[in-house]
Every structure is written in structure tokens, then in C-alpha cells.
Interface confidence: low
């Protein structure tokens, strides 16, 4: 007698491991022989798709190999033309081991900024990802972590990050570990020891001595006023990723000596400088024996201060005059940053004009240096406070470059301008009057040892020292 | 205010099963690892299990495998540790444990109070 | 198999300084075991310390600091206080696999 389909071993879920074989059976009882259908996410699966094969009569579908795409709800369909068709429905669960799909690389960064390493995986269940560095599994802490996609966040890098990572993707059916990468943490060049500053008798032999680290180790070069080095020797030793370099010289002149250390970082470079001043004793010889040259100031950094194409003093007892004095008064400049507003602008206008003097030219050309007023003006009104720390550092010899030897003038040994008004050059920038000072706070308990000049005001002055001062 | 509070433990005959359960609060219980740790009577601590934030793989101490898995509900913010084939070796407290980071292996930086689980006939 | 060590009482005085220590009964104890101390008091949950070797918790005094010294993890407290009167507990990690993350036996400091 015909006999209605009748699925009589329901799909059940299938788990399967990817590139494994699944199988679903659909068994019917009917008469005549049922016609079964396979769908998979209600898409018709064709009797000659070479991915599956279905036998029995189409009651079993295989999955010859699977893949993780084969994810799905399969359905068999029975129908004979007696009654309606039956169907039976279940899941394919597709399992897989763990698997690195972009696995961690090599990495080079530098120290202070932010590491990533990638580590992304597939897997079912979801693998959970740790990282091992050398042998030992890595921790996490405020500046590492294990992020959710898997990679490896490391915050402000250190040295001691540096080293070899790989990472672990386990689930339970499996554990899978990526390549071992290495992590190099490079060190910006930095100086470990400055040389020192040396006041030394003529003709004798100092030797300056520079130290710097960092990753890779880096190199040192010598620059002597601006130049390299011409003379001297130089002796060089390297250990524990630290260079020390010392340089001996035969000291005929005053200089200003730089030691750079330079180290390479892909393709960009990180230098560090520290210098050191050679002043020779009793080398202040009579101005009319200063030998140099008038030119008009190109620099930089005194720009706002010295009046517009103003004649200084090169002296060529250095090397390259502009560059040396140039870098003098840089690195005083610096010293400067921490300088109450009401000394700086003052402390400004006082270094360029000491170290680039007004020039008289002529047959020969001659500094003329700052009046006396004007120097005890800022020594003891305007920088009243940082003066005496700075007085106090210098006997304690707290500077380590100590370029404010060079760059802050002996107020007591300058000529006064009441001796010869021409033999002086007066700070135009300090445009001051005793009305003004009056109003000014005190710097000081003892009064200044000099009456404040009364000066008709600059026209050109690019900032007045004032209760209300400004600086262009 | 973080808490991690235990709960399930009892007394159970040998080759009996318990669920311990661990209620956390007070921070972002799917940002971290966790992990149990038991301490019998009188004795030291003695680490059993660790589970990482997702769940994905877990951690057993080599006498209790087989026999113990510990597993978590993010929604929840549960961590469970399902004891079968309970010995009397296995009575001890059992606490729960957050770790310092996501993996299972972190330093336990918060603990429950523990719970007693006792394993006599 | 390798246990980790501890002494089992120590001592010491309010005001003064003691050294607990962690020790391997073969090898080493270096920084890539990332020794943590834990402190329980009688009756309470033990309490983390310290973690990595020399790294405190939040909330733990200054008075408690980790090192390595020699061949040994070691927790030292300098200027002792009655409430520091507890087990300490050191716990190391033994190799790659995170199932070895060992408790030592513990040392019950007493505060004199």
C-alpha cells in the first residue's frame, strides 16, 4: 500500500573539525521510494556539487572536506506524491583548532613610545591568546597588555622590554604558537657625562672627556668654536652600550668646545650636545689688542635685541667669530628660561650686547664695551635675585657648562660712562628712567651701588623694562 | 567597590559534585583573568584553575584534571568551578581570585572570602 | 619535583626589619619566576602584596618591598607594625606553562 514519508532519525547538530568529513542522515520510511532533497541555509545543495556526496538513496549527505564557510542549518526534504513532503532540519557546527592568521613581526622602536605586536586568530571555540617572552610567559601589567584581538600593547617601551616574543592561540582542541619575534628597543643618544669647563694658564694641556649611551651606541664628534676639531687628540672606549670619548688639547686660545653624540634610528638621526668653555687666566688682554673684525649682525638670537644692522665685534680668535659667539650666547640664552620676566628681557639686551660688543671700526677695529651703569643695572635692580644665586652656583661650582663665564660681564672692570661717553655702549633696550624705577618692587634690600643713568628713551627700543614691559 | 563573593560550597561524600559559584562587582569582570585557588585546613594555598577574560581556554592543576572545569558567564559576571569525583584531599576553602590582566596568568590582586568545601563520609 | 621554600616562623620586633624568603629546592629563583607575595591574616582572605618581584600593590604600605637577592626572592619589611603579624605566602611561576604558578609553604611572622 502507498505509504506516506516518515523521517524516522531526525537531523541532529553536527560537530565537525575543519577538513574533516560530516555526515548527516535523513532515514525515511515510505512506499514508493521517496525523492530527498538536501538544503543548506535553504539553498539547494546539487547532486553533482564534487564538495558533497549523498548516498542511500539521498538519506546520507557527507561534507567531504570541511570548511569553516560550511557553517549552517542543513534540511533533508522527503517527498513520494503520497501526502505532503516531510522535512527534518540540523545544525553543522564547524570546529576548528587554533590558528594564527596574522601572526606577530619583528619590530624595531624606540624607547618612550607605544609597541603593538599583532597577533590575530581564528578558532572555534575563540581561542584565548597569551605571549611568552624568552621562556617565560609574559605578564601584564599598567603598561602591557594583552589586547582583545590578541596582539601585544606595550606602553612607553623600556630597554628592558626588548627581547624575544612569540604568541600562544589555545582553545579546547588545540594550541597554536606563532614564529618567535624579536622586539629591539633603540635609545635616543644621550649624554651620560658633560665635559667641564676649565679656566687654565696658557699653553697647557687640558683634556675634556664626554660620555653617552643609547642604542645603537652612539657616536661622539668634537667641535672646537663651531668647526671640528683641528687639533687635539681624541681617545675612544666602548662598553655596556656606552662611549666615552676623551679629548686632549694644547691650549694656546679661549674656546668653546662641543661634544655631539649622534646615533642613527632607521633613517633619522638623535644627537645630544654638551659644552664646555676654555678660558685662559689673565687672557683679558688691552682692547686695542683684540684682534677681529667689524661685521653687521646676522644672527639669530639676538635679533629682538641688538638694533637693526648694528655693527658687532667678530673675534677671530675663533675659528668661524659669528658661529662661535653665536653658540655662546644660545646656550646663556637657555640658562635664561628660568629667569623671573622682570630680569629676562634685561639679562637679554645685557648678553648680546657683552658678546656681540658694538664695533668702532677703523684701522683697527674695536669692541666697545658696556657701560658700567648700564651692567650694574641688571646686576643690581633688574636680575638682583638670580645674580646673587647665580654668583652663589658659580663658587660652588654648581655650573656644569659654565658658559655664564663668558657670557656675564664684570660690571666693576667695564668704563663708566661719565668717564668718557664715547668709550661705552649704553642698552638701548633698557629703556628705564627713575620715575619708572620707583614704581618697580623691590629686588633687593641693599640699594643699587650706582645712580641709574637718566637716559632720553630709545625711540628704537623693541621693549621697555617697566612696571609694563613687553617683548618683541 | 570590588567584591568577589563565593558561594556553593557544603559538605559532599566522596565521589560527590559541588558547583561553586564566585558573584564579582565593582570592576570590569570580562577585562580580566580569573582564578581559583583552595587552601585545606591548617595548610597553605595551593592553586587549582585559571580561566582568561574570553573564556577561550582554561587551567588546571594536574590532580584536580579531569575532574574540576572552571568556566565563566561575562553576562553575568560569574566564574563557576564544577567539582566532580570529589576526593577528601579536595576539602579545603576555595577562593576566588581576579587576576591583574586579561590572560590567566597574572598576579591575584583581589580575593573573595572563600568558601568551605567539605569531602567526608 | 621542585618546591618552593620558605621559613616556617620568623620574628621580629615593632620598629625593626625582617627579611622573609623564597627559595627553589633546585635552582634559582629569577625575575622570569615574577615571585608575588601574598599576606593573610588569621581568619581572612589573603591579601596581594606584591607582584613581579618589586612591584606593590595599591594600598600596600611603603614599609613592604620585593627583591631578588642571591638565589632567592625575598620580601623585607622595614619598621614593623603589630597589624603586620601573619602568614606571608610567596608564589612563583615554574617553567612556560601557567599550571605551574606554585604557593610556597608560607612563613607565620610574629610581631614581639
Known amino acids: 500500500l502507498p505509504k506516506a514519508p516518515v523521517i524516522t532519525t531526525p537531523l541532529e547538530t553536527v560537530d565537525a573539525l575543519v577538513e574533516e568529513v560530516a555526515t548527516f542522515m535523513c532515514a525515511v520510511e515510505s512506499y514508493p521510494q521517496p525523492e530527498i532533497s538536501w538544503t543548506r541555509n535553504k539553498i539547494l545543495i546539487k547532486l553533482f556539487d564534487t564538495r558533497y556526496s549523498i548516498r542511500e538513496n539521498g538519506q546520507l549527505l557527507t561534507i567531504l572536506s570541511v570548511e569553516d564557510s560550511d557553517d549552517g542549518i542543513y534540511c533533508c526534504t522527503a517527498n513520494n506524491g503520497v501526502g505532503g513532503a516531510v522535512e527534518s532540519c540540523g545544525a553543522l557546527q564547524v570546529k576548528m583548532k587554533p590558528k594564527i592568521t596574522r601572526p606577530p613581526i619583528n619590530v624595531k622602536i624606540i624607547e618612550g613610545l607605544k609597541a603593538v605586536l599583532p597577533c590575530t586568530t581564528m578558532g572555534n571555540p575563540k581561542p584565548s591568546v597569551s605571549w611568552i617572552k624568552g621562556d617565560s610567559p609574559l605578564r601584564e601589567n599598567s603598561r602591557i597588555a594583552v589586547l582583545e584581538s590578541g596582539s601585544l600593547r606595550i606602553h612607553n617601551v623600556q630597554k628592558e622590554d626588548a627581547g624575544q616574543y612569540r604568541c600562544v592561540a589555545k582553545n579546547s582542541l588545540g594550541t597554536a604558537y606563532s614564529k618567535v619575534v624579536k622586539l629591539e628597543v633603540e635609545v635616543f643618544a644621550r649624554i651620560l657625562r658633560a665635559p667641564e669647563s676649565h679656566n687654565v694658564t696658557f699653553g697647557s694641556f687640558v683634556t675634556l672627556h664626554c660620555t653617552a649611551t643609547g642604542i645603537p651606541v652612539p657616536t661622539i664628534t668634537w667641535i672646537e668654536n663651531g668647526n671640528a676639531v683641528s687639533s687635539g687628540s681624541i681617545q675612544e672606549s666602548v662598553k655596556d652600550r656606552v662611549i666615552d670619548s676623551r679629548l686632549q688639547l694644547f691650549i694656546t686660545k679661549p674656546g668653546l668646545y662641543t661634544c655631539i653624540a649622534t646615533n642613527k634610528h632607521g633613517e633619522k638621526f638623535s644627537t645630544a650636545k654638551a659644552a664646555a668653555t676654555i678660558s685662559i687666566a689673565e687672557w683679558s688682554k688691552p682692547q686695542k689688542d683684540n684682534k677681529g673684525y667689524c661685521a653687521q649682525y646676522r644672527g639669530e638670537v639676538c635679533n629682538a635685541v641688538l638694533a637693526k644692522d648694528a655693527l658687532v665685534f667678530l673675534n677671530t680668535s675663533y675659528a668661524d667669530p659669528e658661529e662661535a659667539q653665536e653658540l655662546l650666547v644660545h646656550t646663556a640664552w637657555n640658562e635664561l628660561k628660568v629667569v623671573s620676566p622682570v630680569c629676562r628681557p634685561a639679562a637679554e639686551a645685557l648678553l648680546c650686547n657683552h658678546i656681540f660688543q658694538e664695533c668702532s671700526p677703523g684701522v683697527v677695529p674695536t669692541p666697545i664695551p658696556i657701560c658700567r651703569e648700564y651692567c650694574l643695572a641688571v646686576k643690581e635692580l633688574f636680575c638682583a635675585k638670580e645674580w646673587l644665586v647665580m654668583e652663589e652656583k658659580t663658587h660652588r661650582g654648581l655650573y656644569r657648562s659654565e658658559m655664564h663665564l663668558l657670557s656675564v660681564p664684570e660690571c666693576s672692570k667695564l668704563p663708566s660712562m661719565h668717564w668718557d661717553p664715547t668709550a661705552c655702549a649704553r642698552l638701548p633696550h633698557l629703556d628705564y628712567n627713575k620715575e619708572n624705577l620707583k614704581t618697580f618692587p623691590p629686588m633687593t634690600s641693599s640699594k643699587p651701588s650706582v645712580d641709574i643713568p637718566n637716559l632720553p628713551s630709545s625711540s628704537s627700543s623693541s621693549f621697555s623694562v617697566s612696571p609694563t614691559y613687553s617683548m618683541t | 567597590e570590588l567584591q568577589l563573593v563565593e558561594s556553593g560550597g557544603g559538605l559532599v561524600q566522596p565521589g560527590g559534585s559541588l558547583r561553586l559559584s564566585c558573584a564579582a562587582s565593582g570592576f570590569t569582570f570580562d577585562d580580566y583573568g580569573m582564578s581559583w585557588v583552595r587552601q585545606a585546613p591548617g595548610k597553605g594555598l595551593e592553586w587549582v584553575s585559571a580561566?582568561?577574560?574570553?573564556?577561550?581556554?582554561?587551567y588546571y592543576k594536574e590532580s584536580v584534571k579531569g575532574r574540576f572545569t572552571i568556566s565563566r558567564d561575562n553576562a553575568k559576571k560569574t566564574l563557576y568551578l564544577q567539582m566532580n569525583s570529589l576526593k577528601s584531599e579536595d576539602t579545603a576553602v576555595y577562593y576566588c581570585a581576579k587576576r591583574s590582566g586579561r590572560i590567566a596568568f597574572g598576579a591575584l590582586d583581589a580575593w573573595g572570602q572563600g568558601t568551605l568545601v567539605t569531602v567526608s563520609s | 619535583q621542585t618546591v618552593v621554600t620558605q621559613e616556617p616562623s620568623l620574628s621580629v620586633s615593632p620598629g625593626g626589619t625582617v627579611t622573609l624568603t623564597c627559595g627553589l629546592s633546585s635552582g634559582s629563583v629569577t625575575s622570569s619566576n615574577y615571585p608575588d607575595w601574598y599576606q593573610q591574616t588569621p581568619g581572612q582572605a589573603p591579601r596581594a602584596l606584591i607582584y613581579s618581584t618589586n612591584s606593590r600593590h595599591s594600598g600596600v604600605p611603603s614599609r613592604f618591598s620585593g627583591s631578588t637577592s642571591g638565589n632567592k626572592a625575598a620580601l623585607t619589611i622595614t619598621g614593623a607594625q603589630p597589624e603586620d603579624e601573619a602568614d606571608y605566602y610567596c608564589?612563583?611561576?615554574?617553567?612556560?606553562?601557567?599550571?605551574?604558578?606554585?604557593f610556597g609553604g608560607g612563613t607565620k611572622l610574629t610581631v614581639l
Open positions: 580561566i582568561p577574560w574570553n573564556g577561550g581556554s582554561t
Open positions: 608564589a612563583l611561576y615554574m617553567g612556560s606553562d601557567i599550571r605551574n604558578y606554585v
